[in-house]
Amino acid sequence: IIDGYKCKEGSHPWQVALLKGNQLHCGGVLVDKYWVLTAAHCKMGQYQVQLGSDKIGDQSAQKIKATKSFRHPGYSTKTHVNDIMLVRLDEPVKMSSKVEAVQLPEHCEPPGTSCTVSGWGTTTSPDVTFPSDLMCSDVKLISSRECKKVYKDLLGKTMLCAGIPDSKTNTCNGDSGGPLVCNDTLQGLVSWGTYPCGQPNDPGVYTQVCKYKRWVMETMKTHR
């Protein structure tokens, strides 16, 4: 997260880190005791999932292996549409005040809505500085019409933009797949943006979760 702040401890109990060994690979969001939602571009063969801590590499955090993941069937490595994936944990998480599932959206929030994005991604770009603490950034949803002025045809119908005018605050390497939460519901998953990160008036681009609720529910049901 560029130009963000340290999240209030315990305020993001649904935030997970997808690790490759001990190294951050992507963010993710707990949606059920067996399931984590993340970006399709975060796919790996297997994952180490850290839950229940704001500190990356926290020895006291829950760590659960995941060997199965289900990309949206429409994910395109060319256009990056449908950049969403479910990761099935090999064992259920132990829910607590530090580990909770996020609320999936009942509706799509409108432009102008205040939201928070979080992650352990680099706080500097292009040279990287990875924080140990979970970082947050407060951003607002931007209409597709406004966002298309920047990204033109790169912006797909189920992509969502967020940012703050004239501000550098944005997501970056390592934040992928992490949550954009608006009014206590998951509205976005970090997908992409311009690079180096933090260029004012280049919004962060997210997968618009409200458009995928049926796919999420059906996929979890199918692979119970």
């Epitope: 190294q23 571009h41 790996m44 990056h80 045809d153 390592g174 992409w192 943006g193």
Partner: antibody
């Protein structure tokens, strides 16, 4: 030191295959994409394809589809490009290059290997 | 696929000259265009990304401009080490990434 180091020059007969390696060091290999670009003698640059080091996702140039395979070995931070059924017009310097960006989309090549000369001759 | 056309294909210039190279896309690519410099026997090197942003460590005599379909690389005062071939590429509609044909800058 951040670098991509490629394997040495190759001489191959028409119809044979070649496999070029590209070893990354000084950065987290699995967080970036590796592309392959070739340059025939005295000619311009031609994009061949790319691979995501973490997911293994590939995209290949249409004209090479079916003849090229790109792979990675994350344990050694090495990318490979294999080209089969070689023809004389495959004679070129083959470069690996790292793409810069974050998340699903990348924007430019910010690091290149030194190049590997592949000569196809009977 | 988007075609990238560079002009001129070669030019002769003297040290201290202002040099301009152009790159035209077959359709709009917004500002997702980059410029590279390649010297004989060497790999290309990034100069400019996003049409106008100077890559770290590149001398300020290099500049880029343009958006949509027409782009320019300018060397404000040519130095001996700038004699090389210059390429543009586009990352708007990818894959494939497409390169311009190159412009060779030679000593007059």
């Amino acid at each position: 030191q951040v670098q991509l180091v490629q394997s040495g020059a190759e001489v191959k007969k028409p119809g044979a295959s070649v496999k070029v390696s590209c070893k990354a060091s000084g950065y987290t290999f699995t967080s970036e994409g590796i592309h392959w670009v070739r340059q025939a003698p005295g000619q311009g640059l031609e994009w061949m394809g790319s691979i995501s080091a973490s997911s293994g996702d590939t995209n290949y140039a249409q004209k090479l589809q079916g003849r090229v395979t790109m792979t990675t070995d994350t344990s050694t931070s090495t990318a490979y490009m294999e080209l089969r059924s070689l023809r004389s017009d495959d004679t070129a310097v083959y470069y690996c290059a790292r793409s810069a960006g974050y998340g699903a989309r990348h924007w430019y090549f910010d690091l290149w290997g030194q190049g590997t000369m592949v000569t196809v001759s009977s | 696929d988007i075609q990238m056309t560079q002009s001129p294909s070669s030019l002769s210039a003297s040290v201290g000259d202002r040099v301009t190279i152009t790159c035209r896309a077959s359709q709009s690519i917004s500002s997702y265009l980059n410029w590279y410099q390649q010297k004989p026997g060497k790999a290309p090197k990034l100069l400019i990304y996003g049409a106008s942003s100077l890559q770290s460590g590149v001398p300020s005599r290099f500049s880029g401009s343009g958006s949509g379909t027409d782009f320019t690389l300018t060397i404000s005062s040519l130095q001996p080490e700038d004699f090389a071939t210059y390429y543009c590429d586009q990352w708007y509609s990818t894959p494939p990434i497409t390169f311009g044909g190159g412009t060779k800058v030679e000593i007059k």
